[in-house]
Each structure stands twice: as structure tokens, then as C-alpha cells.
Interface confidence: low
Amino acid sequence: DNKGYCAQYRGEVCNAVLAKDALVFLNTSYADPEEAQELLVHTAWNELKVVSPVCRPAAEALLCNHIFQECSPGVVPTPIPICREYCLAVKELFCAKEWLVMEEKTHRGLYRSEMHLLSVPECSKLPSMHWDPTACARL
């Protein structure tokens, strides 16, 4: 459900990844969107500590830009999803091994909560930058 509002990012986890005055989409399906989305990032971020140095920065960028999507202040505030190409680059290039492990763990039900599922975008469902360059965010 894409009901929410635009606000400046005031969290800590994604400070180094998001632009200084980034306008992000806060989803009002959560009672406290800022806190809930920050917790999502924080939980997933901790799991990234064990991934390779090549994967980590790319995964952090993907994670922060997926959970705190860029917000377009329109007639109704709208989240701008990550471009499919950037998601696939992280999945197939920078983090191929880690992504496979994660998908296997998910398939076998080895995660304690569903929270990490919300942290990982499905690349195939994201818009391509070749369809409309303004319809998605570039990492």
C-alpha cells in the first residue's frame, strides 16, 4: 500500500548512504513509519556485517534506497522505486554468492522473522530505467 508522506530522512543507519537532505517516503501503513522503517534497515544492516567487502557497500545502498525510497512530492506523495538494473547489478554482480545463500535460507525457512523479506526487493518487479528514466531511482 503506497499511502504515506514525504519527509527528510532523520535516522542514523542510512545517513552515510542517503543524500544529506534526502526526501524519503514514509509508509503510513506503519503506526510510526520512521521508527518501523529504521528498525527494518537496522535489522537487515546487522546481517550485512558478515558479507564480503565487495558486496557490503552495494547491498547497503540497495537496502537503504529500498526501505527509504526517494519520495516524489506530487498531488499525492509517491515513492520512487529503485531501477531494476541497479537491483540486478547488486544481485548478480556484487552480491551474487550472498544473494543465493539468502534465497536458499528463505526457501528453507531459516530466518527467525519475516522482517528481512521486506528489506530485499524483488528485482524483476522493479521498473526499468529504459521504460521511463524518471520512474525509478538510480543508486
Epitope: Y5, L23, T28, V75, V76, P77
Partner: antibody, heavy 118, light 108 residues
């Protein structure tokens, strides 16, 4: 609390310009379009246009194209509406308004009376 | 450009129901908003997206929209409901907003 505070009443001569300000507080100013609406004495509401405070992009009603300019200063969370080549029928109350997460206008400024008279 | 037509006035006795219509070509395909404006005051949003009510607006205010007509219904009308009422739509093709002509509601 969330509010929009506008500048005070103005009296202008025909042919002059007027610039009305609208200061936002209590919410993220750059997160929502700011609209300008006017109402002539005894008349209905008339939408003039919007500004995207984040990008500075604007969209004006056909009627005001070429005469209206909407700007903003994000450092002080303030939107401006300037109307040039004023005529007597521009005498009206000018209001800023915004919709916080909905496409309707749920917050309004108190209005600024602009009188155009020779 | 898109035109919204409202009756100039509606009169209603206290405790009765007032219905204000807003006519527009295929208005049912658009989201309609309704505003109440009392003399010398800024408009107040009473119904948005056809039938949703902002917090603080009594349940007596309701809206519907289909075909070429949107309707604002005020049930159990009170003296304090006397005001001008305006419908509004966003015309997505032009990215412009349009207000209706306005209806003066008089409580007898």
C-alpha cells in the same frame, strides 16, 4: 502545529505587481505541493496553480499563464506568489493551501487581501 | 477545460438532510473533494476522495460519486452548517485543479 501563515493585506495600483508570501511550519515543507487559490469578493474559489517546493517546478492555471510566478525559499519554508500587470478584477483574497498526503487541500493559510485600485 | 456545476443555493430545515450536487462530465472517474466555507474564514475540507472524512469532521457529512454527479450529504443539519460549499476535482490530464461554482446552504 501544522500551519500556513501569509503576509498582510496589500493595496496596489493597476499595472503594478504584488508578491504574497506563505510560511509553512509543523511539517516538511518540501514534501508537499503548495497551491494558490484566490476568491474575489462575493465570488467562488479559483485555483491559480501549484509549486513543487522540492524541485521548484510549477504548473499554472491557463488563465494566469504569463502573469503569475510561484517561487519558494526552502531555507525559510516559505512559498511566494507574484501576480503582475494587476487589474481591478484581480482584487481578491489570495490563499496558499496544501494537502498533507492527500490530493485535497487540508491546510490553508489565513488569506491575504489584495486590493487593486487607482 | 473541465467544468463543475453546483446549484447556487440549497435550503434545509434543522434536523433534516441537505444534499448538494456537483455535476461534471464523467465525474465518477475522478476523486471529488468538498469544502465548507463560512463568511470571512478559510475553506475547511469536509470530505475528500469522494467519501473520506478528515479527522474532526462529524459523521453527518458524507459523500458519494458516480456517473456525472457527485453528492455531498449533510444529515441532521444544524445551524452551524450554514455556509458555502464547494466541490473540487483534480484533472489528471492537465494536472490542474478545478473548483465547482459553489452552493450556499441556508438553514431555515
Amino acid at each position: 502545529q501544522v500551519q500556513l501563515v501569509q503576509s498582510g493585506a496589500e493595496v496596489k495600483k493597476p499595472g503594478a505587481s504584488v508578491k504574497v508570501s506563505c510560511k509553512a511550519s509543523g511539517y516538511t515543507f518540501t514534501g508537499y505541493y503548495m497551491h494558490w487559490v484566490r476568491q474575489a469578493p462575493g465570488q467562488g474559489l479559483e485555483w491559480m496553480g501549484w509549486i513543487n517546493p522540492h524541485s521548484g517546478g510549477t504548473n499554472y492555471a491557463q488563465k494566469f499563464q504569463g502573469r503569475v510566478t510561484m517561487t519558494r525559499d526552502t531555507s525559510i519554508s516559505t512559498a511566494y506568489m507574484e501576480l503582475s500587470r494587476l487589474r481591478s478584477d484581480d482584487t481578491a483574497v489570495y490563499s496558499c493551501a496544501s494537502g498533507l498526503g492527500i490530493s485535497a487541500f487540508d491546510i490553508w493559510g489565513q488569506g491575504t487581501m489584495v486590493t487593486v485600485s487607482s | 477545460s473541465y467544468v463543475l456545476t453546483q446549484p447556487p443555493s440549497v435550503s434545509v430545515a434543522p434536523g433534516q438532510t441537505a444534499r448538494i450536487t456537483c455535476g461534471g462530465n464523467n465525474i465518477g472517474s475522478k476523486s471529488v473533494h468538498w469544502y465548507q466555507q463560512k463568511p470571512g474564514q478559510a475553506p475547511v475540507l469536509v470530505v475528500y476522495d469522494d467519501s473520506d472524512r478528515p479527522s474532526g469532521i462529524p459523521e453527518r457529512f458524507s459523500g458519494s460519486n458516480s456517473g456525472n454527479t457527485a453528492t455531498l450529504t449533510i444529515s441532521r443539519v444544524e445551524a452551524g452548517d450554514e455556509a458555502d460549499y464547494y466541490c473540487q476535482v483534480w484533472d489528471s490530464s492537465s494536472d490542474h485543479y478545478v473548483f465547482g461554482t459553489g452552493t450556499k446552504v441556508t438553514v431555515l
